[in-house]
């Protein structure tokens, strides 16, 4: 009779994470008797998959009933398959010995690969606020999948960005790979509204690729510009001065109002307007009593935004000349300057 | 500056768990991953896994999957592994070591001074 | 797994002299698509964790003296101390970080006479 051989006709196969393998092996001879085992890997560190004869192998079901007396195939399933059970897999008949079964010979293997899907994308931006401008850097990481063959976009709005670095690691062999990417995106100050999106497409995820997203709200500082005027006359003696904030973001905002250097006034930006960009418009007035002045009063707007140095706009209100008019002229003003007089 | 400090050292029962800690210092936690070697008396360095402290993922050597638990807390910055069932074998010193995931994939250029279990009965 | 053997695995030299020990992977450690050689050495003093001192095979770790070398590539790689001192005694590991599991070399302990 012809001798035993062990036939796997699978050189490969390719399995999904999460789903079973099938592990196809027979046998062409019932002769000499001793038992199967499956083995991953070759060689003296070899990993005991599958023992017929015993032990308990909780992921491993046969496919045939293997106590039958006439059974040839000793095809095995394996359930829930990780990246981590790539490998070749061997299936070797034994010999009944004694005291211990001899290895009689092994099928040729069959190599099993294991898609893995990516994690979700994750994006991280800059740990500090960025002023328009200025270039920052996002991070896109995405773990666990397999083959390594992957491809990362960067978007800004829509729109594909170039300026980004990718690295898959590792470069070598793997049960799975992780991919980490860095993009560098200028700052507009239209980009409170922004949103920048890591895009990743992978042969698991059959066409349909997953996204991971950081809104540039989180990332931007828009400063404020400052704008103070005075207000036509309210009553005798009384002016009002306003100090125009617009176009900041975010909304932390100080406001504090100086006479001549000193403190008359500090506020918290509450009742903003927003406008369509996503920035925001403050005002803030001052009533100042003009006789209570003999001389010329220096008044300035002071503006802490987002914990920065403060920036200050100052107006002068004359009040030593011509006092009886004072309050009978609206201001006039200098073109390009911030200076108001009264006459 | 750059520091990784270890846990000291532990005696433990075969059989015992043990959980040690690296805590980071000296730049952002984030930006690196965190990787584990193993180093037997008078042997060898063995790599045991990493964890990437941003999302929490955690790669093994197939060889310490069922004996090795990596994790990280952002808040403390700091890595944490746990060794479970141990036995002899498992008497070493254990080494934290960052690693650079940005531009350019480097080796570990930064380690803790390690932590040594000894496991008897 | 990637097997990494170092030679010798120990040698004694005097002050001064050049040593140079050698580093073998049973895989080519070359990436083609960026040509750098994923292998690292590292030096590990007695009672001390171990020290960076070359990574992509001969790029110098910052702060490490000039006169330790890298070369090699694919999988030959060779470390080279052009003039020992005494604080040099210690043992020297190489890693490759092509594939996962990493895993290093035996080591080769260097010794003064």
């Known amino acids: 009779e012809e001798e035993l051989q062990v036939i796997q006709p699978d050189k490969s196969v390719l399995v999904a994470a999460g789903e079973t393998a099938t592990l196809r092996c027979t046998a062409t001879s019932l002769i000499p008797v001793g038992p199967i085992q499956w083995f991953r890997g070759a060689g003296p560190g070899r990993e005991l998959i599958y023992n017929q004869k015993e032990g308990h192998f909780p992921r491993v079901t046969t496919v045939s009933d293997l106590t039958k007396r006439n059974n040839m195939d000793f095809s095995i399933r394996i359930g829930n398959i990780t990246p981590a059970d790539a490998g070749t897999y061997y299936c070797v008949k034994f010999r009944k010995g004694s005291p211990d079964d001899v290895e009689f010979k092994s099928g040729a293997g069959t190599e099993l690969s294991v898609r893995a899907k990516p994690s979700a994308p994750v994006v991280s931006g800059p740990a500090a606020r960025a002023t328009p401008q200025h270039t920052v850097s996002f991070t896109c990481e995405s773990h666990g999948f397999s083959p390594r063959d992957i491809t990362l976009k960067w978007f800004k709005n829509g729109n594909e960005l170039s300026d980004f670095q990718t690295n898959v690691d590792p470069v070598g062999e793997s049960v799975s790979y992780s991919i980490h990417s860095t993009a560098k995106v200028v700052l507009t100050r239209e980009d409170v509204h922004s949103q920048v999106i890591c895009e990743v497409a992978h042969v698991t995820l059959q066409g349909d690729p997953l996204r991971g997203t950081a809104n540039l709200s989180e990332t931007i500082r828009v400063p404020p510009t400052l704008e103070v005027t005075q207000q036509p006359v309210r009553a005798e003696n009384q002016v009002n001065v306003t100090c125009q904030v617009r176009k900041f973001y975010p909304q932390r905002l100080q406001l504090t109002w100086l006479e001549n250097g000193n403190v008359s006034r500090t506020e918290t930006a509450s009742t903003v307007t927003e406008n369509k960009d996503g920035t925001y418009n403050w005002m803030s007035w001052l009533l100042v009593n003009v006789s209570a002045h003999r001389d010329d009063v220096k008044l300035t707007c002071q503006v802490e935004h987002d914990g920065q140095p403060a920036v200050s706009k100052s107006h002068d209100l004359k009040v030593s000349a011509h006092p009886k008019e004072q309050g009978s002229n609206t201001a006039a003003e200098n073109t390009g300057s911030n200076e108001r007089n009264i006459y | 500056q750059v520091q990784l400090q270890q846990s000291g050292a532990e005696l433990a029962k075969p059989g015992a768990s043990v959980k040690m800690s690296c805590k980071a210092s000296g730049y952002t936690f984030t930006s690196y991953w965190m990787h584990w070697v193993k180093q037997r008396p008078g042997q060898g360095l063995e790599w045991i896994g990493y964890?990437?402290?941003?999302?929490?993922?955690?790669f093994h050597n197939q060889k310490f999957k069922d004996k090795a638990t990596l994790t990280a807390d952002k808040s403390s910055t700091t890595a944490y592994m746990q060794l479970r069932s141990l036995t002899s074998e498992d008497s070493a010193v254990y080494y934290c070591?960052?690693?650079?995931?940005?531009?350019?994939?480097?080796?570990?250029?930064?380690w803790g001074h390690g932590t040594s279990i000894t496991v008897s009965s | 797994d990637i097997v990494m053997s170092q030679s010798p695995s120990s040698l004694a030299v005097s002050v001064g002299e050049k040593v140079t020990m050698s580093c073998k992977s049973s895989q080519s450690l070359l990436y083609s698509t960026n040509q750098k050689n994923y292998l690292a050495w590292y030096q590990q003093k007695p009672g001390q964790s171990p020290k960076l001192l070359i990574y992509w095979a001969s790029t110098r770790e910052s702060g490490v003296p000039d006169r330790f070398t890298g070369s090699g590539s694919g999988t030959d790689f060779t470390l080279t101390i052009s003039s020992v001192k005494a604080e040099d005694l210690a043992v020297y590991y190489c890693?490759?970080?092509?594939?996962?599991?990493?895993?290093f070399g035996g080591g080769t302990k260097l010794e003064i006479k």
């Open positions: 964890i990437d402290p941003s999302t929490g993922y955690t």
């Open positions: 890693q490759q970080y092509y594939s996962y599991p990493w895993t």
């Open positions: 070591a960052r690693r650079d995931y940005g531009s350019s994939f480097y080796a570990m250029d930064y």
